[in-house]
Interface confidence: medium
């Protein structure tokens, strides 16, 4: 396989990673809120 450039720009990969992490965190927070709501309604 070809050698990659000595110094490579991975900035767009990192930006996508950051966005995916933010989305995952948002979903986790949403799920937590939903659980809390169900607990309140359940009571």
């Amino acid at each position: 396989s070809e050698e990659p450039p000595i110094s490579l720009d991975l900035t767009f990969h990192l930006l996508r990673e950051v966005l995916e992490m933010a989305r995952a965190e948002q979903l986790a927070q949403q799920a937590h809120s939903n659980r809390k709501l169900m607990e309140i309604i359940g009571k």
């Epitope: 110094s7 720009d9 900035t11 990969h13 990192l14």
Partner: antibody
């Protein structure tokens, strides 16, 4: 909960080889870039290598190029670092980390290169 | 390679006081996307490092809001609104603009 557990460290003679492993759990391993970072005793952090989700791209610090190989097995949720032609200056704790931004770290495994 | 430089290398602080750590890069970390590719990590004594700040100013999940990251181009700062005893450790900046990613030599924060 994200967990990264390194293994495979130990004492090796100069010129010898070691293969480090990192077992990942608590996240979708195959969706993430993975990285190795090392820390020589009493020193700072040094980025060593990283590898793309599918293993198709990998990058190294100059000091390990041609000697170290980063690889992964997504079916086993595992990251590896094959280290050949080891030198005294490779002595360090080796950490595996999730992502390019190093979101989570393992506890590290100590590699000692000495005769 | 991009060289990262910390100042100070040692920072004695009194709990409750504000504090700041500087990091300078040998070339601009400001990308055309408008983001600065600079992360901050903390290594507490006897522990593995942990991500505090990514892309210059974004706090990682679970990081207290007493930490903040600022700066652009080549000059960056990690600020503590008030230092707590649990904040002791070595703080590292790292550039993620291009490989090889490089860390600064670290700033050791200690309690007076």
């Amino acid at each position: 909960e994200v967990q990264l557990v390194e293994s495979g460290g130990g004492l090796v003679q100069p010129g010898g080889s070691l293969r480090l492993s990192c077992a990942a759990s608590g996240f979708t391993f195959s969706d993430n870039w993975m990285s190795w970072v090392r820390q020589a005793p009493g020193k700072g952090l040094e980025w060593v290598a990283n590898i793309k989700q599918d293993g198709s791209e990998n990058y190294y610090v100059d000091s390990v190029k041609g000697r170290f190989t980063i690889s992964r097995d997504n079916a086993k949720n595992s990251l590896y670092l094959q280290m050949n032609s080891l030198r005294a200056e490779d002595t360090a704790v080796y950490y595996c980390s999730r992502g390019l931004a190093l979101w989570g770290w393992g506890q590290g495994t100590l590699v000692t290169v000495s005769s | 390679d991009i060289v990262m430089t910390h100042s100070p290398l040692s920072l004695p602080v009194t709990p409750g006081d504000p504090a700041s750590i500087s990091c300078r890069s040998s070339q601009s970390l400001l990308h055309s996307t408008g983001y600065n590719y600079l992360d901050w990590y903390l290594q507490k004594p006897g522990q593995s490092p942990q991500l505090l700040i990514y892309l210059g100013s974004n706090r990682a999940s679970g990081v207290p809001d007493r930490f903040s990251g600022s700066g652009s181009g080549t000059d960056f700062t990690l600020k503590f609104i008030r230092v707590e005893a649990e904040d002791v450790g070595v703080y590292y900046c790292m550039q993620a603009l291009q490989t090889p990613y490089t860390f600064g030599q670290g700033t050791k924060l200690e309690i007076k």
